[in-house]
């Protein structure tokens, strides 16, 4: 019967008595930077070309016995997970292996860098189809390793890495912390985060998604027909590398940004038990388990968006946090969140010719997060319209006044330390979807975009008194681009998007002693692209 | 996933004004930085990745590496250039004493230096 991990990543339409999705990634080359591998294992023979690249440190210990099958164990298993004949994800993908880990599974940042450089030079000498690089390794945070990954990603290579097996914040490790890399955490057959001895999968905002990573059956280097079960975020990353190979084989022109958005979009949502993660990491960790798309073509009409959290600002009075989108994504909205509720909102601003989302801490606050909503919107022309604090009037308003521009997000930023001591604003009058409304002492920022066929609408859900959180979701066929809260009073901790749902968090009324008249409303801006929908229909 | 994550140790060594016999003095006001792994057992002192500024050509990387070796030799230190990077990042990998870091940080074109560290199969 089909192994649990292959069943988990397979959409129901492919599930027969065996795992055989269409097109096994045959147009894609997957580079594996790992241990040596047994390339003539029955599972992978003819699928893996062992390059002559080797850069490994000497094994530790004077009495270390170099046993070939042990030296090959990790890499052979991962090659099998990516492209194995019987237990692999992308059965048609061809692989190339580089040895950067020794027989104890240990390597160096410098050896990995030289390996990445080798791949880049190979790509320049002999350009082939799409390339996926699998990095099933982790070390401490490394500026240089992250920089090398960024350069390779900008050269059109898709990098997939293990989040790490340290039951810790993945942002403290490299290459897991590199923004351009697709970072993968591990889940088990029950969709729970994987525990590995006293440790387990890493988590946090540097993880893009999770994938099966416990009891994964794959090629064993113990013999040429052997299989073995292994666990770890390497196994999870290998699943995503395989899925990426299949997606790229079906659509070879996909950019890294498009691929990442699709991986997120087709993932199983909200199936992971977040209680396993430390409380302060739950909101930052994506609740996504990777899966193959239900069909290899035709996802192009979707408006894809993802949520990007910034690093924590730190607690100083003027501390700010910045969330950035990838180079070919559009920042369609910006929000902020603070566990203490002490924040001074957020704003979209230009930095290096690109919009970023900046959140501002407030005096006495423990720090803030900026949350960017990053979307794929071809031929988009977006700008930010700002209204300074209205002071005297009932509230500050700003709208998209340019012809053909639609509102995709609202942000508000204030200089006063605590808006809660001021009168709450009036809620936005109905029938004016293209405007943002906020507190009279706040400056309001509207993200206004023009793109072919783009249409947006506002959805609100309010509750009379704060009860922890209020949510509002976009319906099928619409994508959440903006998420904000009304009003901006002190009991609102912030707003953020989780998949297609806008979440507004507030302190419980019982702990704040607020009055019931302070209603909290979650405001979602939902968009779709008729242009993309028509384009995909014309292709079919 | 931000490059600004500050949870690794950063040692900033300001460039002193003394020329130290350099043909090309570094641009005024720039400060090369030194980075090392925050996890002490994973550090590999004695091997360093010297990363040069983005537009540095291979010939300049090689020249900078040779200059480091020459200046180190004048101080009685042996160094070994293990690899010259080009294609992804300009720079070089050098085996040397940590005593030479201050000297290396003053070399022209240097953006930052990172001490080598271990990575592990996951």
């Amino acid at each position: 019967s089909i192994p649990w991990n292959l069943e988990r990543i397979t959409p129901p339409r492919y599930r027969a008595d065996e795992y055989q999705p269409p097109d096994g990634g045959s147009l894609v080359e997957v580079y594996l930077l790992d241990t040596s591998i047994q390339s003539d294992h029955r599972e992978i023979e003819g699928r893996v070309m062992v390059t002559d690249f080797e850069n490994v440190p000497e094994e530790d210990g004077t009495r270390f016995h170099r046993q070939a099958s042990k030296c090959d164990s990790h890499g052979t298993h991962l090659a099998g997970v990516v492209s194995g004949r019987d237990a692999g994800v992308a059965k048609g993908a061809s692989m190339r292996s580089l040895r950067v880990l020794n027989c104890q599974g240990k390597g160096t940042v410098s050896g990995t860098l030289i390996g990445l450089e080798f791949i880049r030079k190979s790509q320049l000498v002999q350009p082939v189809g799409p390339l996926v690089v699998l990095l099933p390794l982790a070390g401490g945070y490394s500026r240089v390793l992250n920089a090398a990954c960024q350069r390779l990603a900008r050269a059109g290579v898709v990098l997939v890495t293990a989040a790490g097996n340290f039951r810790d914040d993945a942002c403290l490790y490299s290459p897991a912390s590199a923004p351009e890399v697709i970072t993968v955490g591990a889940t088990n057959a029950q969709d729970q985060p994987v525990t590995l001895g006293t440790l387990g999968t890493n988590f946090g905002r540097c993880v893009d998604l999770f994938a099966p990573g416990e009891d994964i059956i794959g090629a064993s280097s113990d013999c040429s027909t052997c299989f073995v079960s292994q666990s770890g975020t390497s196994q999870a990353a290998a699943h995503v590398a395989g899925i990426a190979a299949m997606m790229l084989s079906a659509e070879p022109e996909l950019t890294l940004a498009e691929l990442r958005q699709r991986l997120i979009h087709f993932s199983a949502k909200d199936v992971i038990n977040e209680a396993w993660f430390p409380e302060d990491q739950r909101v930052l960790t994506p609740n996504l388990v990777a899966a193959l798309p239900p069909s290899t073509h035709g996802a192009g009409w979707q408006l894809f968006c993802r949520t990007v959290w910034s690093a924590h600002s730190g607690p100083t009075r003027m501390a700010t946090a910045i969330a950035r989108c990838a180079p070919d994504e559009e920042l369609l909205s910006c929000s902020s969140f603070s566990r203490s509720g002490k924040r001074r909102g957020e704003r979209m601003e230009a930095q290096g010719g690109k919009l970023v989302c900046r959140a501002h801490n407030a005096f006495g606050g423990e720090g803030v997060y900026a949350i960017a909503r990053c979307c794929l919107l071809p031929q988009a022309n977006c700008s930010v319209h700002t209204a300074p604090p209205a002071e005297a009037s009932m509230g500050t308003r700003v709208h998209c006044h340019q012809q053909g521009h639609v509102l995709t997000g609202c942000s508000s930023h204030w200089e006063v330390e605590d808006l809660g001591t001021h009168k709450p604003p009036v809620l936005r009058p109905r029938g004016q979807p293209n405007q943002c409304v906020g507190h009279r002492e706040a400056s309001i920022h509207a993200s206004c975009c023009h793109a072919p066929g783009l249409e947006c609408k506002v959805k609100e859900h309010g509750i009379p008194a704060p009860q922890g959180q209020v949510t509002v979701a976009c319906e099928e066929g619409w994508t959440l681009t903006g998420c904000s809260a009304l009003p901006g009073t002190s009991h609102v901790l912030g707003a953020y998007a989780v998949d297609n749902t806008c979440v507004v968090r507030s302190r419980d009324v019982s702990t704040t002693g607020s009055t019931s008249e302070e209603a909290v409303t979650a405001v979602a801006i939902c968009c779709r692209s008729r242009h993309l929908a028509q384009a995909s229909q014309e292709l079919q | 996933q931000e490059d600004e994550d500050g949870d690794y140790e950063e040692l900033v060594l300001a460039l002193r004004s003394e020329e130290d016999g350099l043909a090309e003095a570094p641009e005024h006001g720039t400060t090369a930085t030194f980075h090392r792994c925050a996890k002490d057992p994973w550090r590999l002192p004695g091997t360093y990745v010297v990363v040069l500024k983005e537009e540095t050509h291979l010939s300049q990387s090689e020249r900078t590496a040779r200059r480091l070796q020459a200046q180190a030799a004048r101080r009685g230190y042996l160094t070994k250039i293990l690899h010259v990077f080009h294609g992804l990042l300009p720079g070089f990998l050098v085996k040397m004493s940590g005593d030479l870091l201050e000297l290396a940080l003053k070399l022209p074109h240097v953006d930052y230096i990172e001490e080598d560290s271990s990575v592990f199969a996951q």
Epitope: D17, Q38, D40, V48, S224 | -
Partner: antibody, heavy 115, light 109 residues
């Protein structure tokens, strides 16, 4: 091009041993092992075993285990299959083929066991 | 006694389609994606026609196709031609080895 070239025909007495060679060329040897398959006159194909060019590991079919030894000489890209204690029912054409997938075959070596 | 069962012979006229079956168990054909089909002309080595159930090596005519359902694999040859007359063998992985079918003699009438 990819080729497997086998040694010539052999006639052996019962109880003797035979050693057949197979020289591989035209591909990355370590990416594939070599399988040995035999075919008795007018009969079907029988898989005898496999050997790795990468590390010399072997996997023998139960039926010939104990009588067969497969070896490699990486310097000449050659694999050898030795069968001992020959019997008349070992009379067959012996083929080497690339890997478990057996996508490329040698021309065959006829081994006749007769007293 | 071969581990995989094939019909001893099948026949067809030029232009017709024929199917050869190969029945095993869940420990071989049913348990693996690696079912292969070989064509063998008299006095020649076998030639790989189908691998991994349904894949054709380059150079093999698209008249040859393979499929699998449960523990049975099938080879279909459409538009029969005189040169298709040969012996056909299936093979499959088992947990530690390889097994062949007994072979099917295809006669083109």
């Amino acid at each position: 091009q990819i080729q497997l070239v086998q040694s010539g025909a052999e006639v052996k007495k019962p109880g003797a041993s035979v050693k057949v060679s197979c020289k591989a060329s035209g591909y990355t040897l370590t990416s594939y092992g070599i399988s040995w398959v035999r075919q008795a006159p007018g009969q079907g194909l029988e898989w005898m075993g496999w050997i790795s060019f990468y590390n010399g590991n072997t996997n023998y079919a139960q039926k010939v285990q104990g009588r067969v030894t497969m070896t490699t000489d990486t310097s000449t890209s050659t694999v050898y299959m030795e069968l001992r204690s020959l019997r008349s029912d070992d009379t067959a054409v012996y083929f080497c083929a690339r890997g478990y997938g057996m996508d490329v075959w040698g021309q065959g070596t006829t081994v006749t066991v007769s007293s | 006694q071969s581990a995989l069962t094939q019909p001893a012979s099948v026949s067809g006229s030029p232009g017709q389609s024929i199917t050869i079956s190969c029945t095993g168990t869940s420990s071989d054909v049913g348990g693996y994606n690696s079912v292969s089909w070989y064509q063998q002309h008299p006095g020649k080595p076998p030639k790989l026609m189908i691998y991994e159930v349904s894949n054709r090596p380059s150079g093999v005519s698209n008249r040859f196709s393979g499929s699998k359902s449960g523990n049975t694999a099938s080879l279909t040859i459409s538009g029969l031609q005189a040169e298709d007359e040969a012996d056909y063998f299936c093979s499959s992985y088992t947990s530690t080895s390889m097994v062949f079918g007994g072979g099917t003699k295809l006669a083109v009438l």
